[in-house]
């Protein structure tokens, strides 16, 4: 019987994005007093716990901790909560929350195509290049929840590169790029070194966000 | 440094079964799957199935369906396959391996069936 | 009969270089990554290789991998005596839903 009950919210703390052998803790949490949750992943199998609500403060919650992350955990999560034990009832899915191992190949190179100082108003494109035969590049800005994501291109020089065009700049930020294979679209490489893009001028707002999330990364997998 | 352990070879008759054991140390048992393959005399290698310990559901080949039962115990860091309705054709090398798409291997446990 | 192909057997003379092919289909190479191990006679496989080109720590740059489509295939150059084994190629098939190997290959080193 799903969706008797709104949907529950599902957290990573203290992100999505989880280093190779590293914690992250899922959380199920809903103002609905729900007895039970279950979790369930999307990955090679599909695999679902049951896990026992705890209630605080008018909230209902359940932690699923991943002691050290592994490709084989890596997938797209959901969360459902439950009211009844036997048969469960069960509510609407949460959002889906896809779990990323990062830091299992060779860490790509990103650089500002104009250099990392720019004018305000000024066109940013980020390039972001390995020589590992990387099919999909992800871009992250510190405190934005999604990526973007665009295919890389074989260059000239022996290279794979993606270019990222952010638009004219108004803000400045942190920016880092990870690498993947389109047949394993949980499993990410080492992260870029940091690029610092300041912006001289007087900007009223950052760059737009991206418009498509990144939530489903493509066909679950699992590799190791 | 990763190691897989398992259980020494065995000798059983056509329709008992089998169990074989897979001790994991130097990682984290619980958050890589386990799989099993086998390797009959002079053939190649097949997979049978597999387990994430920390999930606790096991998948099998369509092959072994029914027949093939994989268990994790977290506490022992110990994987188990029992293969039950056992016939000559089963005599293989078996052989434990971290992840679905395996790095580290066991040193394989030699079942032998026989009348 | 594997659902992937390797050819049987293949050999070389020291020094050399060696090309192993493996040839699956869209549900298993063509939309999964490959991997390739190394069997030295009585032992357990060894990973070589793992998402279609990345060798495994500890192995040498003298194995390479590449897949295109729905094949792949595994470079040894400068062949030694200690590369003498069967080397096997292996996918996740999504129609069987399980990781599926080649036949294998014998390569002899001359």
């Known amino acids: 019987h799903e969706g008797v009950h709104r949907k529950p919210s599902l957290l990573a703390h203290p992100g999505r994005l989880v280093k190779s052998e590293e914690t992250v803790i899922l959380q199920c949490w809903s103002d609905v007093m729900f007895e039970h949750f279950l979790l369930h992943r999307e990955g090679m199998f599909n695999d679902t716990l049951r896990l026992i609500g705890e209630h605080h403060d008018g909230v209902s919650k359940a932690n699923f901790s991943i002691s050290r992350m592994t490709q084989d955990l890596a997938g797209t999560y959901r969360c459902y909560g439950s009211v009844t034990h036997s048969p469960y009832q069960v509510s609407a899915p949460s959002d889906p929350l896809d779990i990323v191992i990062i830091g299992l190949y060779e860490k790509p190179s990103l650089s500002a195509q104009l250099g990392p100082t720019v004018l305000a108003g000024e066109n940013v494109t980020l390039s972001c290049s390995s020589r590992s035969s990387y099919d999909m590049y992800h871009l992250s800005r510190e405190g934005e929840a999604h990526e973007r994501r665009l295919p890389a291109g074989p260059k000239v020089n022996g290279t794979f590169q993606a270019d990222f065009p952010l638009g004219p700049a108004t803000h400045g930020g942190t920016y880092r790029c990870f690498g993947s294979f389109h047949d394993s679209p949980y499993e990410w490489s080492k992260s870029s070194d940091p690029l610092l893009v300041s912006v001289t001028g007087n900007p009223s707002n950052s760059w737009p966000s991206p418009t498509e999330p990144s939530s489903k990364t493509g066909n679950p997998r699992h590799l190791h | 440094e990763v190691q897989l352990v398992q259980s020494g070879a065995e000798v059983k008759k056509p329709g008992s079964s089998v169990k074989v054991s897979c001790k994991a140390s130097?990682?984290?048992?619980?958050?890589?799957?386990i799989s099993w393959v086998r390797q009959a005399p002079g053939q190649g290698l097949e997979w049978m199935g597999g387990?994430?310990?920390?999930?606790?559901?096991?998948n099998y080949a369509q092959k072994f369906q029914g027949r093939v039962t994989i268990t994790a115990d977290e506490s022992t860091s110990t994987a188990y396959m029992e293969l039950s309705s056992l016939r000559s054709e089963d005599t293989a090398v078996y052989y434990c391996?971290?992840?679905?798409?395996?790095?580290?291997w066991g040193q394989g446990t030699l079942v032998t069936v026989s009348s | 009969q594997s659902v992937l192909t390797q050819p049987p057997s293949a050999s070389g003379t020291p020094g050399q270089r060696v090309t192993i092919s493996c040839s699956g289909s869209s549900s298993n190479i063509g939309s999964n990554t490959v991997n390739w191990y190394q069997q030295l006679p009585q032992t357990a496989p060894k990973l070589l290789i793992h998402?279609?080109?990345q060798r495994h720590s500890g192995v040498s740059d003298r194995f390479s991998a590449s897949k295109s489509g729905t094949s792949a295939s595994l470079a040894i150059s400068g062949l030694q005596s200690e590369d003498e084994a069967d080397y096997y190629c292996?996918?996740?098939?999504?129609?069987?839903?399980?990781?599926?190997f080649g036949g294998g290959t014998k390569l002899t080193v001359l």
């Open positions: 387990i994430i310990p920390i999930f606790g559901t096991a």
């Open positions: 391996a971290r992840g679905f798409n395996p790095d580290y």
């Open positions: 292996a996918a996740w098939d999504d129609t069987l839903t399980g990781l599926i």
């Open positions: 130097g990682g984290t048992f619980s958050s890589y799957a």
């Open positions: 998402h279609n080109n």
